[in-house]
């Protein structure tokens, strides 16, 4: 129970982090136009991935898309990637989640099967999810290194009577939206693997023991996994001493650690 | 057909108040923003104050203080709340609507005069 | 506050004859997001309400002959009639339609000659 609940929650938090993903991605508002400490103009200008947007205070808005792939900063097309990759994988990960959900049932397959399935979405949401934090992190560090290089000539005089103004740029809506929905994705990667220890059968090492009834002559043999119905749990022919001891070979370690670029 | 219709002009005392209307038609305030521009008898325009479609509001600094815009949606008019008058303040006082594209002032009124004079 | 400096500040032109304002703000109106320039020009003739002529420094509005055109970026702007007629006699602005305040010229009077 305790198993299917980990898992079931892990694909819903994993769901809810790669819709969020997708979300970033397509917003307009990665970097918006800084306010504070600026003259107050009646234009705000904000910047995505895919377009800059330019909203006049009468409401109007105006977004033009980047329609060159060459003249673009290196930086924003790595975000770009990351971000795809990042979707890319989660949604390959959602669709092997489905099959590998415990609660349902697809034809004859095996726990083995399963247990694998939600091992492989699990690292496919954690990839996934520092994907996401990767862009929305190189994206950031971005922007605040050309807030202070335009803070530093924010006002640059013509002649000591003209003045033009930089205009700054700083965190958007997206980035956060990123780094949540990023996160999510990691969690929810975390709980699919932690599910799949749960589901992942253990081989019995139980040679067939032959038991003496008196009167009676019959062998009882301990049945093999493949009784199991995929429902609940088959107590039969599970190991009652486990103890939950296990060699540091046999613990699955997954990365924990990223760089925020 | 746009039109903006100002009203409330008059002569006052210097220190006295004056509240201005612009009744609004052909569009709605909740839609497009209203300027309030004066012009002084002889003299070049002068930007007052602006409301814009979602209720915010922008001053000139030197009248902020004593002038305050506002609107009321349910008559489409606009008004302009002139405290603390001066001698400086007499001028023809329009109200513009605000133009969509470019921040510009596309329709005006004809304009209501303020005289402040003892 | 943007100060709007408009010059000449009376224009006498011959019927006919083309006729240029010029108008320099102290900040740029240039809005890189865009690339727009927010500079509006308006005409105000004598005894009328003012008209919007020239948006986005050189976007003539609808209704507007196209012997007015507007061109400048940055902080220099220029209004342009390319052949003088009667009826556009009167006083031209420029304004400030990026930072607020908004602000006007002083006005150019075009008269003829």
């Known amino acids: 129970m305790a198993v299917t609940a980990c898992q079931g929650l892990g694909f819903v938090v994993s769901l809810i982090g790669i819709a969020g993903i997708i979300a970033a991605t397509c917003m307009d508002q990665w970097s918006t136009q800084d306010l504070y400490n600026n003259p107050v103009t009646a234009v705000f200008n904000y910047q995505g991935l895919w377009r800059s947007c330019v909203r006049e205070s009468s409401g109007f808005t105006e977004c033009r898309g980047y329609f060159t792939l060459l003249g673009l900063p290196a930086m924003l097309q790595a975000v770009r990637a990351l971000m795809i990759v990042g979707i890319v994988l989660g949604a390959i990960g959602l669709l092997v989640s489905i099959f590998a959900l415990k609660c349902i049932r697809i034809g004859s397959m095996e726990d083995s099967a399963k247990a694998n399935m939600t091992l492989t979405s699990g690292i496919m949401f954690i990839v996934s999810g520092l994907c996401a934090i990767a862009g929305v992190s190189v994206f950031a560090n971005m922007l605040v290194t050309n807030f202070w290089m335009s803070t530093a000539n924010m006002y640059t005089g013509m002649g000591g009577m003209v003045q033009t103004v930089q205009t700054r740029y700083t965190f958007g809506a997206a980035l956060f939206v990123g780094w949540v929905a990023g996160g999510l994705t990691l969690i929810g990667g975390v709980m699919m693997c932690i599910a799949c220890r749960g589901l992942a059968p253990e081989e019995t090492n139980y040679k067939a023991v032959s038991y003496h009834a008196s009167g009676h002559s019959v062998a009882y043999k301990p049945g093999g996994f493949k009784a199991s119905t995929g429902f609940g749990s088959n107590t039969k022919n599970k190991k009652i001493y486990d103890g939950g001891a296990r060699t540091e070979d046999e613990v699955q370690s997954y990365p924990s650690k990223h760089d925020y670029v | 057909q746009v039109q903006l219709v100002e009203s409330g002009g008059g002569v006052v005392q210097p220190g006295r108040s004056l509240r201005l209307s612009c009744a609004a038609s052909g569009f709605s305030l909740t839609t497009y923003g209203v300027h309030w521009v004066r012009q002084a008898p002889g003299k070049g325009l002068e930007w007052v104050a602006v409301i814009w479609a979602g209720g915010s509001t922008n001053y000139n600094s030197a009248l902020m203080s004593r002038f305050t815009i506002s609107r009321d949606n349910s008559k489409n008019t606009l008004y302009l709340q002139m405290n603390s008058l001066r001698a400086e303040d007499t001028a023809v006082y329009y109200c513009?609507?605000?133009?969509?594209?470019?921040?510009?002032?596309?329709?005006w009124g004809q304009g209501t005069m303020v005289t402040v004079s003892s | 506050d943007v100060v709007m400096t408009q010059s000449p500040l009376s224009l006498p032109v011959t019927l006919g004859q083309p006729a240029s304002i010029s108008c320099k703000s102290s900040q740029t109106l240039l809005n890189s997001g865009n690339q727009k320039n927010y500079l509006t020009w308006f005409q105000q003739r004598p005894g009328q309400s003012p008209r919007r002529l020239i948006y986005?420094?050189?976007t003539g509005e609808s209704g507007v002959p196209d012997r007015f055109s507007g061109s400048g970026s940055g902080t220099d702007f220029t209004l342009k009639i390319s052949r003088v007629e009667a009826e556009d006699v009167g006083v031209y602005y420029c304004q400030n339609a990026y930072f607020y305040p908004f602000t006007f010229g002083g006005g150019t009077k075009v008269e003829i000659k």
């Open positions: 986005w420094a050189s």
């Open positions: 513009a609507r605000a133009a969509y594209y470019g921040n510009g002032l596309d329709y």
